[in-house]
């Protein structure tokens, strides 16, 4: 049966009609409109944009569009007391100061309210001391420094290059190492692709460009003052000393021109190996402190930013479902930007806008989706996923009972090479089937499917003839839906060639140079990649909202569970003596995965055969599919991370952006050889195997015949 049958509409109102209505030229116009001034969270400009989007979504034909506001903790530089870093001589005189702002790009010289580069939520402070270069400030970098090189960061100011891991993890690692300040910088090795010019002549980062960003370690908490609950009018707020995830030492970001001035004087130990060297003409000495001639000079930070409770606004649009209005498919992406948001987030927001317009056009012609579609323009994503998290906290009871799926829509592009998808295994088949029906926008793949170009350019490491689909991590607005609530989630965007471009993210990420012109001149002049991403995101939403049987395949979860069990077992077996001493067995986990595999297979057989004209049975089967992701949620959460409750996936404890499988077991095993009480440590490994095995078994049983 067609996916339209249950909504009793004319056949032309199908997926094809929806996709054909999406236009690259509209996305281009919307992107231009959204990027002419800054839309920093908590500012009047971003409130005005929220009201504009509300108005336009209503015009497009949504049933209702409301603003949902919250009062959350944000962070801003002091306008009259700027942040900067100095080199000071033995008399305390400042002999070098870092720049106070990025040189504005051509055409934007007279724009007001460009927030200068800062690390959001840095505490105030003016620490001074010797510098230690800590590479990317990853866990393994501090292991190398402290354990192998015997370098003590206690009481030092550390300088770390951006890239590889989320900046908040860098700051947390520096704090744990005893540092009293952190300087973050963009090294050309990571943010300057060879053979490409700097902006405005190309898409590379100029020396004065700086990456902004928050440095929180929220672990899914949302607003730091109201963890677990919405920051509404009657909220009880924690004191700032009890706030979740705030850094305790001053932090500030700089560009590579300024970094050169700090790093060129570094003395002390040589870099341990070539992986610690960037592309600047400096020795990359680790320190501590400056070399001979400059040994009496110190580094001093001047940080005066303030944390302020500020009102933010989400825009929530509703397109009511005709048959199952109490089942929600959500498409959400953020609206707030650090400056102009040319890529992040407005390349995503423009795509959402066009998707809403297309759905609205169909609705005006008499069509409705089977299920309700919710559209969201989130605020304050850049300050810790605050808008989406507060809204989900406020609506958690509805979402956990009615949420079918969440599709994220931040930046549509981070390159123009091929598709990149991260999603729950439940969506693998949906993504495969959809991309087989879409045309590839890639040069050399004219007349070929998106699936074909994607598979050729980004092959699966395990399955030949299939594309790579990655695990969901965090660092974006799907976090609360997937990691906390257990709603099946996915994201898609166009990306770079990771093999030839080793830089982290895209070079102009979170800088003033992320403009409309960056996209229109260098990334996607025809907006064909944006259109493709709109087709993927919109197509996923369409199918999730309109197919009679939910397009989830539980057998794909069985496959990955086995893969993840094999992987975590292998990590554990690297400690054979302890495994033997403490009688560590994975029998329960492998047995649970086997049961899940068998039950999922039987469920899939029943799914093919059942009477789809019986609405009660249809609803029952769909509910089993919808609630499968929910079944992987442990109400107690992961150790010390109560808002990360998914037992199969969590953001890595060492990099928020990355996903980790069986995170409870993984974290229990991590660096276990250094634990002071091995018996206790291996006891926790065994407990985590038990939790994982129980959860997989319990999830399997939700797919069994109900009686």
């Amino acid at each position: 049966k067609s996916s339209n049958e249950a909504t009793n509409i004319t056949p032309k109102h199908n997926m094809k009609a929806f996709l054909d209505e999406l236009k690259a030229e509209n996305i281009k116009k919307f992107l231009y409109n959204f990027t002419q001034i800054p839309h920093l969270a908590g500012t009047e400009q971003n409130f005005q944009l929220a009201k504009q989007i509300q108005s336009q979504w209503k015009e497009f034909g949504l049933d209702s569009v409301e603003l949902a506001h919250y009062d959350v903790l944000l962070s801003y530089p002091n306008k009259t007391h700027p942040n900067y870093i100095s080199i000071i001589n033995e008399d305390g005189n400042e002999i070098f100061n870092t720049s106070l702002f990025e040189p504005p790009p051509p055409g934007y010289e007279n724009v007001s309210d460009i927030v200068p580069p800062f690390s959001a939520f840095s505490p105030q402070g003016m620490p001074e001391g010797d510098l230690v270069y800590v590479n990317y400030a990853r866990t393994e970098d501090f292991f190398k420094l402290e354990r192998d090189m015997k370098i003590n960061c206690s009481g030092k100011i550390v300088i770390a290059r951006y890239g590889k891991v989320f900046r908040g993890n860098k700051v947390k690692n520096a704090q744990l190492a005893g540092a009293k300040g952190v300087i973050l910088y963009s090294d050309p090795a990571d943010y300057f692709a060879p053979g490409v010019k700097s902006y405005p002549d190309g898409w590379n980062l100029p020396g004065g460009g700086v990456q902004r960003g928050n440095i929180l370690n929220l672990n899914g908490a949302g607003d730091p003052l109201t963890p677990g609950y919405p920051a509404n009018e009657y909220a009880y707020r924690r004191g700032i000393a009890e706030a979740v995830g705030l850094p305790s030492i001053p932090v500030h970001p700089i560009g590579y021109y300024d970094a050169q001035k700090l790093l060129e004087k570094m003395g002390g130990s040589a870099p341990p190996d070539s992986s610690w060297r960037g592309s600047l003409k400096v020795p990359y000495n680790v320190g501590p402190g400056f070399t001979g001639n400059f040994s009496t000079q110190k580094v001093k930070m001047h940080i005066h930013s303030t944390n302020e409770v500020t009102r933010i606004y989400n825009v929530i649009g509703t397109l009511r479902g005709a048959v199952e209005p109490d089942r929600y498919v959500i498409l959400g992406g953020h609206r707030d930007s650090w400056v102009f948001g040319g890529i992040d987030p407005q390349s995503g927001a423009a795509v959402v806008h066009e998707i809403v317009r297309s759905f609205g056009t169909l609705k005006k012609e008499g069509w409705r989706p089977r299920r309700t579609i919710l559209f969201a323009s989130w605020d304050a994503e850049e300050f810790g996923l605050l808008g989406s998290t507060e809204w989900a906290e406020e609506n958690s009871r509805l979402l956990q009972e009615r949420g079918v799926a969440y599709i994220n829509a931040d930046s549509s592009i981070e390159g123009n090479y091929t598709l990149r998808v991260d999603c729950t295994p439940l969506m693998y088949s949906l993504v495969h089937n959809l991309t087989k029906e879409l045309k590839s926008p890639d040069e050399g793949f004219e007349g070929k499917s998106l699936y074909e170009s994607w598979t050729k350019k980004s092959p699966s490491p395990e399955f030949s003839g299939m594309p790579r689909i990655s695990k969901l991590g965090s660092g974006n607005d799907f976090e609360v839906f997937f990691q906390r609530l257990g709603i099946a989630s996915g994201r898609a965007r166009y990306t770079k060639n990771w093999e030839t471009n080793k830089f982290s993210g895209y070079p102009l990420y979170h800088s003033v140079y992320e403009t409309y012109e960056l996209v229109e001149k260098f990334y996607d002049p025809m907006f064909k990649y944006h259109l493709t991403v709109a087709q993927v995101r919109g197509g996923m939403v369409f199918e999730l909202a309109n197919s009679i049987v939910l397009p989830f395949d539980c057998r794909d979860y069985a496959v990955v569970l086995r893969k993840y069990a094999d992987k975590i077992y292998s990590i554990s077996m690297k400690h054979p003596q302890e495994m033997k001493t403490y009688s560590v067995s994975f029998d329960s986990l492998f047995s649970a995965v086997k049961n899940f595999t068998e039950i999922a297979s039987k469920f899939s057989e029943r799914l093919q055969d059942f009477d789809k004209s019986n609405p009660i049975v249809l609803r029952m089967m769909n509910d089993q599919l919808m609630f499968l992701e929910r079944a992987f949620i442990d109400p107690l959460g992961l150790p010390d991370r109560p808002f990360y409750r998914h037992v199969i996936y969590a953001p890595s404890s060492h990099n928020k952006y990355a996903g980790e499988s069986f995170p409870g077991i993984y974290d229990a095993l991590f660096d276990i050889e250094s634990k002071v009480d091995p018996s206790k440590a291996w006891g926790e490994v065994k407990r985590q195997i038990y939790v994982a095995a129980f959860t997989v078994q319990a999830a399997a049983e939700t797919l069994s015949e109900v009686a």
Epitope: K563, M573, F590
Partner: nanobody
């Protein structure tokens, strides 16, 4: 009752090859990942390699990568370790292990000229 029985060890010259086998019984072999662990004379246990349900999921300690290959035949409930370009430092008792609880009795591999 779980039983793991290794075979295939012996004396071999440096650069030579051996293939170890581990016959498993008393459990559904295909359900479980399996490992090889070794113990050199006077040393502690060292993990060598693990394999998931099929040959797509394999893991090796760095020192044997490119020289050793782990494989399994689920229809025969047998685990294998093909060892090529053997070195003196590969001399050890090699154990087949299901996890921390179930191990074989081991088979001795001696690499010597």
């Amino acid at each position: 009752e779980v039983q793991l029985v290794e075979s295939g060890g012996g004396l071999v010259q440096p650069g030579g090859s051996l293939r170890l086998s581990c016959a498993a019984s008393g459990f559904t072999f295909s359900t479980y990942a399996m490992s090889w662990v070794r113990q050199a004379p006077g040393k502690g246990l060292e993990w060598v390699s693990s394999i998931g349900e099929n040959d797509r999921t394999t893991y090796y300690v760095d020192s044997v990568k490119g020289r050793f290959t782990i494989s399994r035949d689920n229809s025969k409930s047998t685990l294998y370790l093909q060892m090529n370009s053997l070195r003196a430092e590969d001399t050890a008792v090699y154990y087949c292990a299901k996890d921390g609880v179930h191990w074989g009795q081991g088979t001795l591999v001696t690499v010597s000229s």
